[in-house]
């Protein structure tokens, strides 16, 4: 079954970091671009970052830009998203999906920022 | 950035209702417009993706239309499970993929 | 431009080897996964191996499983298919080709192919 | 493996013709739908991609459409440069797999 897991979300306070791993499985997952979303509390869904299959290239919304890193390990199927100098504006449930169709999700993961 | 909207942002309707709701993009996307539902507490959802093509497993109830900068999601007779809230999401400007602010779709 | 070259085709007996190369120019070779595809005469397509961009991932249809090897130079800009343990059946036109470096696409551009002939 | 099956495998058609070749999967490959078009002699040329999405350069003649594991590939007005063999993809997971081809032949 084509599955993804997000991990590692949580409480953190302003400036810090956290580090989000999204396990993927039941599909070839070299083959695939990725892509982090995410939706703030009773707010609509904002797309972060996207990776290409390779790893090669990484795309970024503006609102993440210089602070979020998106990396991937094709030898492990799992995705991460490096997110450093945290704001009360990051606090999101944060859904990886698959590829250019986002055809398949996680069930979210929540990173809360507050002190 | 190509910026999406979306109407109404909720609506209340009755079982066996058919339903339209509509998306516009701020420049044109071609065809390139995917629809999501999204249940409270889950993942959106995949219903929809190149304006009009219904992804396996989905209802025929469920279809779309349009091209360039707007779009309709139609559910012709609403099911108790279609209460959800609905996105546009274009994906011509990739990788910038843009969302709507979402539809509501509640019970009346 | 975009350019794929493969070099190596020939004609070679049951059970010995041949090793084809592709030479990439006109884009960021070592970004893109690269495949080889074969097309016995007057048949359809055949996907043969897949190489991630970096080398690091290889992988075969069952039909050549265990004796062909992809592999890559990315300072060379250059792909490789050794063969080994032909047989008449390997005999086709390959192509070398371009995967999507974006998302899973399928090739986008395509060499003008290689012909293999095994044959006694 | 997923097969991939195509159908039909030829079929003659006339200039301006509308004409629409058909491709199955043997189990849900979501977009993830490729076609080619190869003439004698030639390699492949990719035309569409991820079922909808036309190739940089191809005619708008040329279109694309369905998922999961039923699509179809539907030229609007042959043109005499459009006789050729057509070939589904799927590039869903590996090993990737053809079709058998669809030769479309004058008429």
């Known amino acids: 079954e084509v599955q993804l897991l997000e991990s590692g979300g949580g409480l953190v306070q302003p400036g810090g970091s956290l580090r989000l791993s999204c396990a993927a499985s039941g599909f070839t997952f070299s083959l695939y671009s990725m892509n982090w979303v995410r939706q703030a509390p009773g707010k609509g869904l904002e797309w972060v970052s996207s990776i290409y299959s390779s790893g090669g290239s990484t795309l970024y919304a503006d609102s993440v830009k210089g602070r979020f890193t998106i990396s991937r390990d094709n030898s492990k199927n799992t995705l991460y998203l490096q997110m450093n100098s945290l704001r009360a504006e990051d606090t999101a449930v944060y859904y990886c999906a698959r590829g250019r169709a986002f055809d398949i999700w996680g069930q979210g993961t929540m990173v809360t920022v507050s002190s | 950035d190509i910026q999406m909207t979306q109407s109404p942002s909720s609506l209340s309707a009755s079982v066996g209702d058919r339903v339209t709701i509509t998306c516009r993009a701020s420049q044109s996307v071609g065809t390139y417009l995917n629809w999501y539902q999204q249940k409270p507490g889950k993942a959106p959802k995949l219903l929809i993706y190149a304006t009009s093509n219904l992804r396996s497993g989905v209802p025929s109830r469920f279809s779309g239309s349009g091209s360039g900068t707007d779009f309709t999601l139609t559910i012709s007779s609403l099911q108790p499970e279609d209460f959800a809230t609905y996105y546009c999401q274009q994906s011509y400007s990739i990788p910038r993929f843009t969302f709507g602010p979402g539809t509501k779709v509640d019970i009346k | 431009e975009v350019q794929l070259l493969e070099s190596g085709g020939g004609l070679v007996q049951p059970g010995g080897s041949l090793r084809l190369s592709c030479a990439a120019s006109?884009?960021?070779?070592?970004?893109?996964?690269m495949i080889w595809v074969r097309q016995a005469p007057g048949k359809g397509l055949e996907w043969v191996s897949y190489i991630s961009s970096s080398g690091g991932q290889t992988w075969y249809a069952d039909s050549v499983k265990g004796r062909f090897t992809i592999s890559r130079d990315n300072s060379k800009n250059t792909l490789y298919l050794q063969m080994n343990s032909l047989r008449a059946e390997d005999t086709a036109t390959y192509y070398c080709a371009r995967g999507d470096d974006y998302d899973s696409s399928g090739p986008d551009y395509w060499g003008q192919g290689t012909l293999v002939t095994v044959s006694s | 493996d997923i097969q991939m099956t195509q159908s039909p495998s030829s079929l003659s058609a006339s200039e301006g013709d509308r004409i629409t070749l058909t491709c199955r999967a043997s189990q849900s490959i979501s977009i993830y739908l490729n076609w080619y078009q190869q003439k004698p002699g030639r390699a492949p040329k990719l035309l569409m991609y991820a079922a909808t999405t036309l190739q940089s350069g191809v005619p708008s003649r040329f279109s694309g459409s369905g998922s999961g594991t039923d699509f179809t590939l539907t030229i609007s007005g042959l043109r005499p440069e459009d006789f050729a063999t057509y070939y589904c993809?799927?590039?869903?997971?590996?090993?990737?797999?053809f079709g058998g081809g669809t030769k479309v032949e004058i008429k």
């Open positions: 993809q799927q590039s869903y997971d590996i090993p990737l797999t």
């Open positions: 006109g884009f960021t070779f070592s970004v893109y996964p």
